[in-house]
């Protein structure tokens, strides 16, 4: 059976204060079944950024309905960036389970916030 | 504000068990991976443990098979279980919120565990 | 693991003077290097990280610089509330996190 892939498209995205961002993931496979989250960094120390779940994530919503049977966008939208969300972004798949088992990150994509036009 | 309280330091005898807890506020908990820091008096600091955002669990090498880090979402509450409990972890313990950088940009005021016979 | 060695181990320096002291780590780490500031009986208050980047509330007198195995924090004008233990860490290779074993800044 054909590896599933995790496909983050943009390598970098530019956006400018105060608007909103929209960071990109399909996956290629509905197999195996699991949850995706979005985290920013990498290792120990990455923070959540969004889990349909479970969580608080007042500033972001999901492009797609995620909960739509057969659903392979799990593209996200955070509303109103600051200068502080810049930074890698990743889209990750995990295998259901308890706990849930990490299978396959994209590659990430950059966030850069460029200063609001005056 | 973000705020870190740790609690449940004290004296125990080598070979005893301790717990300690760390309060967390101010933030969302379960969006950041935590950690504890420790520093034995007069000394400089020593990581210790951290738990991830999806309860993956890391050790220092002195620790390892001793203690046990864990979280409670919920409660917006991290642990430290410490058993088998030597002289050389007298300490003072830190908990601390990580960063996406994976650097501790917010503290507690430290519990204190005292390791003597 | 990588080991972090600053020097020097205490600085005396007078209120108003610069202060520059450093931090070698054993393999590369790129520009992933954090400063922390520890007054007695405090915690530790994270300064600086990715070698040059204030973190937040942090005054503008504190500076960092190098990259790849050697570093530096400055204090372009030491306050009165600057005399503290300087602590570097790295954040590249984990686990487990590093730190050095601290500079000492003490009024001359």
């Known amino acids: 059976e054909e590896e599933l892939q995790v496909i983050q498209p943009e390598k970098s995205v530019s956006v400018a204060a105060g608007d909103s961002a929209t960071l990109n993931c399909t996956v290629s496979s509905l197999i195996p079944v699991g949850p995706i989250q979005w985290f920013r960094g990498a290792g120990p120390g990455r923070e959540l950024i969004y889990n349909l779940k479970e969580g608080h994530f007042p500033r972001v919503t999901a492009v797609s309905d995620p909960t739509k049977r057969n659903n392979m966008d799990f593209s996200i939208r955070i509303s109103n960036i600051t200068p502080a969300d810049a930074g890698t972004y990743y889209c990750v798949k995990f295998r259901k389970g308890s706990p849930d088992v990490e299978l396959k990150s994209g590659a990430g994509t950059e966030l850069s916030v460029r200063a609001k036009p005056s | 504000d973000v705020q870190l309280v740790e609690s449940g330091g004290g004296l125990v005898r080598p070979g005893e068990s301790l717990r300690l807890s760390c309060a967390a506020s101010?933030?969302?908990?379960?969006?950041?991976?935590v950690t504890w820091v420790r520093q034995a008096p007069g000394e400089g600091l020593e990581w210790v443990s951290l738990?991830?955002?999806?309860?993956?669990?890391y050790y220092a090498d002195s620790v390892k098979g001793r203690f046990t880090i864990s979280r409670d979402n919920s409660k917006s509450t991290l642990y430290l279980q410490m058993n088998g409990l030597r002289a050389e972890d007298t300490a003072v313990y830190y908990c601390?919120?990580?960063?996406?950088?994976?650097?501790?940009?917010?503290w507690g005021l430290g519990t204190l565990v005292t390791v003597s016979s | 693991e990588i080991v972090l060695t600053q020097s020097p181990g205490t600085l005396s320096v007078s209120p108003g003077e610069r202060a520059t002291f450093s931090c070698r780590a054993s393999?590369?780490?790129?520009?992933?290097l954090a400063w922390y500031q520890q007054k007695p009986g405090q915690a530790p208050r994270l300064l600086i990280y990715?070698?040059?980047t204030r973190a937040t509330g942090i005054p503008a007198r504190f500076s960092g610089s190098g990259s790849g195995t050697e570093f530096t924090l400055t204090i372009s004008s030491l306050q009165s509330e600057d005399f503290a233990v300087y602590y570097c860490?790295?954040?590249?290779?984990?686990?487990?996190?590093?730190f050095g074993g601290g500079t000492k800044v003490e009024i001359k």
């Open positions: 601390a919120k990580v960063t996406w950088k994976n650097v501790f940009d917010y």
């Open positions: 101010g933030f969302t908990f379960t969006n950041y991976a």
């Open positions: 738990i991830s955002v999806t309860g993956t669990t």
């Open positions: 393999q590369t780490v790129g520009s992933k």
């Open positions: 990715d070698a040059n």
């Open positions: 860490q790295q954040h590249t290779d984990w686990p487990p996190y590093t």
